[in-house]
């Protein structure tokens, strides 16, 4: 009995740029003999339902189609038949099938890939043309991809234990799509200094698929009018 | 890294007074409001009031005015909350708590006062 | 003062069960409830923020929803370690009130 098994949920998620493997592991009754064994990668687009073999490997015969695709003999020799690829890039994702043959026997599977890009953020303050004790902060994500991404504001005041979601003079601005494929935005928040405590923390909260953690810029509010330093944009509440 | 630590248990007599205090470390003392919450045995949550860490400012609940004060100790980064007339129904475990980062607010370890005759 | 009426007062269920624990406030509180775990002899832990917002490092099993005066907490998936009490709290002022607590048993 021959048999083949993928990322568990179907899906692997990898970094844009990543040296990423693509895991298939095969099951088979007996010791595995490299030299009458064959495996081939295929790979299907998002956008076109057209299959493209990317590696083929057969006894003493290897072929990357893909520039840097490998699949190590050495792990194949224990049953590891996974798809090596330096660099992945945003147009890589997609459905890759791992197709093993162990004559007369052959079996299959499939995962789907997303190559995902994390956001870097920063924040700005843009006083021009604003009004006397008023601010306007930008907080600026670049480069992420998938396009979907939730950016909001939070305060957090001297007193209460707790941030506090800021929905008032918050504009988020549409997303723009770079040459590379990834995307930006812009998070505007307006605020009036004279109205709010000193010591007030206020941070641009950024979450997106590639992040496990939310990233975060903040800058307190000092009883002068505030000007943003590098150390404010990664301090904690603390 | 952010620590607060609360002084030993204590055992009192109902009417008398309790001060526990709370030491602060790993942040600037001064720019902190720290809130004061008792947890009676298997009871709920009650916040009790709070203290501008500079001295300047405190909020007390109204329950526990009169019965109450807050000072802070800058010199040695300590909090203090002094509870008088104790009566049996102050048996509780008394937490300083300060607010937090990411990760959630901090609470100290907790005091347990037993008010007994 | 605001009042929290939280519920269940206890709840027993099953490793892998999803359950829902709910909180009422006497008045509208915004979305400014936060939720905490206790376990015995500890010092309460915070969970949620702003009603639905996780700390870092809290599972991702846990989420909260709500917005006015009513609010819950759900486990998608109970562990083991999730056996014990959560409290509901509103900070949009003070006092700072607490609901009086679920206590999560297993069945």
């Known amino acids: 009995d021959l048999k083949v098994e993928m990322m568990a949920g179907g899906t692997q998620i990898t970094p844009l740029n990543d040296n990423v493997t693509i895991f298939c592991n095969i099951f088979y009754s007996q010791p595995l003999n490299i030299t009458s064994m064959g495996i081939t990668w295929f790979w299907k687009s998002l956008t076109f339902d057209k299959e493209v073999k990317v590696f083929e490997f057969f006894g003493d015969h290897q072929e990357a189609f893909r520039p840097g695709a490998i699949v190590s003999p050495w792990r194949l020799k224990s049953g590891d038949a996974s798809l090596r690829l330096p660099g992945i890039q945003l147009e890589e994702a997609g459905e890759y099938r791992c197709e093993v043959v162990v004559t007369p026997l052959k079996a299959q599977g499939t995962v789907q890939l997303e190559v995902v890009a994390s956001p870097a953020s920063r924040l700005l303050l843009d006083q021009v043309g604003m009004k006397e004790n008023e601010d306007k902060y930008m907080c600026e994500s670049s480069g992420f991809y998938p396009e979907a991404i939730n950016i909001t504001w939070e305060k957090q005041t001297q007193k209460f234990p707790h941030p506090i979601e800021i929905s008032e003079d918050v504009i988020t601005g549409p997303t723009i799509k770079n040459m590379d494929g990834t995307f930006n935005v812009t998070s505007c928040l307006k605020l009036n200094s004279s109205q709010e405590d000193p010591g007030t923390v206020y941070q641009c909260v950024v979450r997106h698929a590639s992040l496990h953690t939310p990233l975060r810029s903040n800058f307190t509010l000092t009883a002068a009018r505030h000007s943003l330093s590098e150390t404010e944009k990664t301090d904690n509440f603390s | 890294q952010v620590q607060l630590v609360q002084s030993g248990a204590e055992v009192k007599k109902p009417g008398a007074s309790v001060k526990v205090s709370c030491k602060a470390s790993?942040?600037?003392?001064?720019?902190?409001?720290m809130n004061w919450m008792r947890q009676a045995p298997g009871q709920g949550l009650e916040w009790m009031g709070g203290?501008?860490?500079?001295?300047?400012?405190?909020d007390y609940n109204e329950k526990f005015k009169g019965r109450v004060t807050m000072t802070v100790d800058t010199s040695t980064s300590t909090v203090y909350m002094e509870l008088s007339s104790l009566r049996s129904e102050d048996t509780a475990v008394y937490y300083c708590?300060?607010?937090?980062?990411?990760?959630?607010?901090?609470w100290g370890q907790g005091t347990l006062v037993t008010v007994s005759s | 003062d605001i009042q929290m009426t939280q519920s269940p007062s206890s709840l027993s269920a099953s490793v892998g069960d999803r359950v829902t624990i709910t909180c009422k406030a006497s008045?509208?509180?915004?979305?400014?409830v936060a939720w905490y775990q206790q376990k015995p002899g500890k010092a309460p832990k915070s969970l949620i923020y702003s009603a639905s917002n996780r700390y870092d490092g809290v599972p991702s099993r846990f989420s909260g929803s709500g917005s006015g005066t009513d609010f819950t907490l759900t486990i998608s998936s109970l562990q083991p370690e999730d056996f014990t009490t959560y409290y509901c709290q509103q900070y949009i002022s003070y006092p700072l009130t607490f609901g009086a607590g679920t206590k999560l048993e297993i069945k």
């Open positions: 008045q509208n509180v915004g979305k400014y």
């Open positions: 790993g942040y600037t003392f001064t720019n902190y409001w």
């Open positions: 708590t300060r607010r937090g980062d990411y990760f959630g607010d901090f």
């Open positions: 203290i501008y860490l500079s001295g300047d400012s405190t």
